[in-house]
Structure formats: structure tokens, C-alpha cells
């Protein structure tokens, strides 16, 4: 399955929107930095396309879920959020189309299941952090920065998959 060129353009737009969402000076948030333990090894180049598509899908789905909460709506600009949802939704559709076309339809490898679980646990840690920080503006900025970094890393994986073909 070939992810359309518009998919990588959408990824770049998503990162741009995340950058635009910033609401306060980040310099005041340094003490709120946190190690969320992004499972970088799950996004290594050793994966084949059949294994990566569901992991990437899980990553984007979790980002969608995180920013679709009531607390998120209160934290960010509504217009930017709506554009952000649209971009994520399109990317989910692209990835789902790939799965339907037969990529990853065969017996799910255990490694892939472990990777999806690792991504879910990563987002659980982010959600817990926000809760502990009482969804403060700085906590949201730390999370936004983290999502920009992890999304960028997963986007790089998509690009490396495309270039391998």
C-alpha cells in the first residue's frame, strides 16, 4: 500500500498546527519538564511496512484522543484544534485504507502487538502527568512539545518507509 503524497503533507501541517497552538512563553515552564519515556525503539527502521502501519495508526489515534478531551478544549484555541482534528482524521483514514488493502491483515505478529501496547502505555503516562499537574497551562505546553517530538519521529519513520520502496 502506498500512502498518498498528501499524507506526508498532512503530517507537516499537523506539526505546524501544533507549533501554532502555543499559548504562553515556554521559558516559564522549564521546571515542569518530564520524562514520558517515548518508546523510540518501537519506531526503529527494523520494522517492515506490515508492522509499522498499525503502530503509526495507534500513535495518531492516541494523539487524537488526547486532544479531544474536555480539558484539551479548555486549553487550546478552538479554531486551531478543529484544523488539528481534521488533519489527524485524514491521516487515520490514509492508514486505515492501507490496512484494508491487506497490509497487516495476516496473523498479527507478537512484536507488533507489543509495540501498540508500548504506545498506549506512553500515552497513559502523558495523561497521568496532566492529571497530576491539574491540567496547568505549563503541563499542556510540556505535553504539546513532547507530542511534536514523538509525532516528528514517527513521521520520519513514514518517510523512511516511503524511500525504501
Amino acid at each position: 500500500c502506498d500512502l498518498p503524497q498528501t499524507h506526508s503533507l498532512g503530517s507537516r501541517r499537523t506539526l505546524m498546527l501544533l507549533a501554532q497552538m502555543r499559548r504562553i512563553s515556554l521559558f516559564s515552564c522549564l521546571k515542569d519538564r518530564h520524562d514520558f519515556g517515548f518508546p523510540q525503539e518501537e519506531f526503529g527502521n527494523q520494522f517492515q511496512k506490515a508492522e509499522t502501519i498499525p503502530v503509526l495508526h495507534e500513535m495518531i489515534q492516541q494523539i487524537f484522543n488526547l486532544f479531544s478531551t474536555k480539558d484539551s478544549s479548555a486549553a487550546w484555541d478552538e479554531t486551531l484544534l478543529d484544523k488539528f482534528y481534521t488533519e489527524l482524521y485524514q491521516q487515520l483514514n490514509d492508514l486505515e485504507a492501507c490496512v484494508i488493502q491487506g497490509v497487516g491483515v495476516t496473523e498479527t505478529p507478537l512484536m507488533k502487538e507489543d509495540s501498540i501496547l508500548a504506545v498506549r502505555k506512553y500515552f497513559q503516562r502523558i495523561t497521568l502527568y496532566l492529571k497530576e499537574k491539574k491540567y496547568s497551562p505549563c503541563a499542556w505546553e510540556v505535553v504539546r512539545a513532547e507530542i511534536m517530538r514523538s509525532f516528528s519521529l514517527s513521521t520520519n519513520l513514514q518517510e523512511s518507509l516511503r524511500s525504501k520502496e
Epitope: 515556554l26 522549564l30 521546571k31 519538564r33 510540556v142 512539545a145
Partner: antibody, heavy 121, light 107 residues
Framework: EVQLVQSGAEVKKPGESLKISCKGS????????IGWVRQMPGKGLEWMGI????????AYSPSFQGQVTISADKSISTAYLQWSSLKASDTAMYYC??????????????WGQGTLVTVSS | DIQMTQSPSSLSASVGDRVTITCRAS??????LNWYQQKPGKAPKLLIY???SLQSGVPSRFSGSGSGTDFTLTISSLQPEDFATYYC?????????FGQGTKVEIK
Amino acid sequence: EVQLVQSGAEVKKPGESLKISCKGSGYSFTSYWIGWVRQMPGKGLEWMGIIDPSDSDTAYSPSFQGQVTISADKSISTAYLQWSSLKASDTAMYYCARHPGLNWAPDFDYWGQGTLVTVSS
Amino acid sequence: DIQMTQSPSSLSASVGDRVTITCRASQSISKFLNWYQQKPGKAPKLLIYFASSLQSGVPSRFSGSGSGTDFTLTISSLQPEDFATYYCQQSNTLPFTFGQGTKVEIK
């Protein structure tokens, strides 16, 4: 390969203006902040200020506030440190270094080679 | 501003010695403490970040510990290339501040 390349040594007279640069390469320039550090001859390191190149938000150490201006041009991945009127006491080595912002990653992991500024009449 | 105080300001040691440098912050900085090594005419080099994380490429003889206000840099077995000046720096809040430095000299 990540690199921060600073402009060359400068010899200036008191009262003159100066702008030195720090060009980043091998990484996403807007994903990291750029900090500036002064080291006077035979002395320790002094933190001057920092810039977020993504939107040019800046913060200064009180000792340097109003004395210098930090800026950046993200289109050419370059940060700047400038003086409008130099003093003899500005004679020092100036370093730039990158900072990961709010991400959990090493602080100031890459440094420029330094720019020696000499102010003498 | 948060003041960073290093001790000692200088020390003499021999190759193979265990060397310990301490850094104290004027208020709690959690684990946001970095250690740098600087040799004459060179830019500082990051050794330890977040108090105890070893920077990539740095020999394992360097280690850091501490949290809150008191921190330590340890060189387990001093090597000839380790003779340099060491600085601690807090990155908990702006303005970031450095310690005054510790010069490690040959005995």
C-alpha cells in the same frame, strides 16, 4: 552531523556596534532553543540569555538585560548576539549552545566554537 | 536568581585517583543540573545532564548524583585527559546559572 558554527573573531573600539552569529545545521533549528554564554579572559562561564527560534521569544539574565540583544532568523538557521555600543569590559569569548526546550533531552549538548570579541581603544 | 556554589575551587590529583566535586544550589532545582568539562581554548563539553544521566560518548568513569540542592560529580579513576575545569549549571528556572568552576590539576 549537528553543528553550531560561529562567526569569526572581532576587534572593535569602545562605542562601536557589533553583531555576531551562530549558524545551526544537521538538526531542526526551530526545535531547539539557542543560548549564549560569556567567558571573560581567565574567568568562568556566565549565562547571558536564550532565544526560541520558532517565534523569537527571548529571555535574558538580569546582568545582561539591556546590554545585549539576542535575535534569530529561522529562514537561515542563524541566531545572533548584538551590542549597540561596546565597552572594554565586553572583551570576552562568546559561545552559543543549543537547548532542547521543554523536551526531556540533554541541555546544551552542542556548542559553537566560540567568538572572541576584543574591545580596545 | 539561583546561586550555584562549587567546591573545591581547585584540586590537585594524580592519575588513577577518585575525584569528587560538589555543587550546591541556593534553592531546590529538582534534578535539573548539568556538568560540563572545559579545556583551555575549547568550548565546554556536556558530561552529565539531569543530575545523573551520562551524555552520549562520555566515558563511564564520570558519574553524577544528587537532587534538590546538593549534587556531586565523581571521576572514578582520573585519566590524563581529565585535567580540566568543571562547571555545574542549573536549568530548573531562568536565568540559568553556572557554578564558579573547579580546576582539576596534576599533583
